[in-house]
Amino acid sequence: LSLEGSRTLTVCPGSVQPLSSQTLRASSSAGTDPQLLLYRVVRGPQLGRLFHAQQDSTGEALVNFTQAEVYAGNILYEHEMPTEPFWEAHDTLELQLSSPPARDVAATLAVAVSFEAACPQRPSHLWKNKGLWVPEGQRAKITMAALDASNLLASVPSPQRLEHDVLFQVTQFPSRGQLLVSEEPLHAGQPHFLQSQLAAGQLVYAHGGGGTQQDGFHFRAHLQGPAGATVAGPQTSEAFAITVRDVNERPPQPQASVPLRITRGSRAPISRAQLSVVDPDSAPGEIEYEVQRAPHNGFLSLVGGGPGPVTHFTQADVDSGRLAFVANGSSVAGVFQLSMSDGASPPLPMSLAVDILPSAIEVQLQAPLEVPQALGRSSLSQQQLRVVSDREEPEAAYRLIQGPKYGHLLVGGRPASAFSQLQIDQGEVVFAFTNFSSSHDHFRVLALARGVNASAVVNITVRALLHVWAGGPWPQGATLRLDPTILDAGELANRTGSVPHFRLLEGPRHGRVVRVPRARTEPGGSQLVEQFTQQDLEDGRLGLEVGRPEGRAPSPTGDSLTLELWAQGVPPAVASLDFATEPYNAARPYSVALLSVPEATRMEAGKPESSTPTGEPGPMASSPVPAVAKGGFLGFLEANMFS
């Protein structure tokens, strides 16, 4: 990697300057794409900040940028004006250039902020040169708020500063009035005044009357050393503008402004809704606006004018629809700082806000809303509803256009059909079931963000409060006992004070759920079951006949049961029991209680176990002899021989 360019940036005080390829230009011997030449800001500027033109100019400091972004003029340095005057200030940025696999290169970018530079944004080289407004035929003090050369003094080292002053030499006098210093008029024989006299409030302009034409004076300002000696240092020649206003003049009244809303990259006319004033004694063409500070999201242009930005326009331009805002690619809102004047009153500050609308928004739905069965309710989060466009939209508002069928949405505990992203993020928006007849629901919302809308459907599912233990593979051709070691809704029973019941929705593909007889005297064999209860599981009354896949050699396979679980006062939930099956292996210990084993293996299994007096199923098989109901195989055969 190599780094070219001057690595110096000259910035006008208080202005924004893009980094350019003249300033910073990286290249690699491999001819790497500028997008892949990455700068990391190791130490940011002290006198200002670095930011990206198309990202939030009020956000966090820029940490990374690419050479491509430098080429595009998107990396900007903004100098922040200090409270104390200065003539020249220096700032540095420490950067690290990287583009693997090349070694990183450290770089320092020097920034010079100087009043010496010619600045289109700032025609004066003085700390202040704002001009003066004076009523016709009257007088007004020229204070340091209007004219201030403190920055020239700031070029002198502070120990000697008290011995120095700034001498203003008037090179062209006002034509419609007089300048006075300590009540003495200035004239060709005495054309000077000092910064110290200005600071003491001794400089006055007196208008001579006879009209409201513009006035002003030209001057040269330079440093003056001890005992009035001229010293080398900064100097400037400028004009000071004096505006004479009609004493009868009523100042214009700015009207409330509505932000301009525009999609990025487009153009929109500025109307009176954005910029208007009430001024009964001025024509629209006499009301002038000047752009003091423009945002980074676009510029103002005049129809019929050049394609570039305009800094001056009139109310007539606005009223006729000639003034337009041209948005660039930025998605960030911005504000124009303007000054408005009717030419006879002091300028008034005004602002024009520009809100960049997304061309489209999208509601991101990352997951359905899962409602825990025993709770019957759940808070929405950004997982369910989040609006994005070219950026995240935290201000999004939602309105239900189709409510849920089996429940309702609550905000702060009360049913609501409208809510905000903020309420979602704070967990205040809750879906609660009110009708416990479905394990699913959905609702449709319309999302609105920055004037654009989009709709989305939020799906709701109930998460079963059911403990499922499938364990290792189960033997094909066997009947195993379905009990709470496999399916257990005991916690749901405790939470609802009811006996949960199950409905078989689907499966198994190879096999069936059966009810096994309680005693030998009970008639018939295993009955096919489609519904059962937690009590049936606890009583050991249920069996799962694990079938063999048809039409192929015995082999391991997967199967499942899909169940709907119901309990009082809560919504039903769908759950599944997924299990693996394999051909029966008599030598293998199975982790479930077997009620029967396949026919062929039964005769080889050795002596039957002794009968248990209770008639309960025997212990789980832990040896080649499987445990079976009624304490042995003969008991099982006897009980089931007519099935």
Partner: antibody
Framework: QVQLQESGPGLVKPSQTLSLTCTVS?????????WNWIRQHPGKGLEWIGY???????NYNPSLKSRVTISRDTSKNQFSLKLSSVTAADTAVYYC?????WGQGTLVTVSS | DIQMTQSPSSLSASVGDRVTITCRAS??????LNWYQQKPGKAPKLLIY???SLHSGVPSRFSGSGSGTDFTLTISSLQPEDFATYYC?????????FGQGTKVEIK
Amino acid sequence: QVQLQESGPGLVKPSQTLSLTCTVSGGSITDGYYWNWIRQHPGKGLEWIGYITFDGRNNYNPSLKSRVTISRDTSKNQFSLKLSSVTAADTAVYYCADFDYWGQGTLVTVSS
Amino acid sequence: DIQMTQSPSSLSASVGDRVTITCRASRGIREYLNWYQQKPGKAPKLLIYYTGSLHSGVPSRFSGSGSGTDFTLTISSLQPEDFATYYCQQYSELPWTFGQGTKVEIK
């Protein structure tokens, strides 16, 4: 603040259909969530009859479901109750409400 | 349906008394409970929603608490305008149901 006002005949003959309308002001019926009808038999407690939601879905009390219809007219900002085959046991004060706010109620007497 | 049972059915109290009315649900309703006040010949007025949230314009002497099946409405210092009948109502499960009411009378 939302205001509700019931209107309809105060006397209905047995076996006929009781019809009441609720006019909503100060808000839209597409904004509130539930628009309910509730009744109160003389000297007794409150009984929920049913609701219509902001998007036009209904739910009724199972004890009255076979006889009740609640509908709405969004253009007039109104919702209505129809209760068919009435008997003297349907004599009550009928209220429309969104639960936060209630109409003042209208007494309906079922008598020949 | 969920049954809502209020107790007592009626009570006599004096101005300034602390009054407590309870409401029991036949099964859990989480916090989805409203309390209403009704005066003779008038419509009910919402006092408290979501068990303990005060409706706008309701004096702070009214408060609600509870969760699940047992709920309480408390009037910290009874005022003359508080003599009325009070109803609880659940909105956890359809159909919505009301308690039978508690009449607060002047002793």
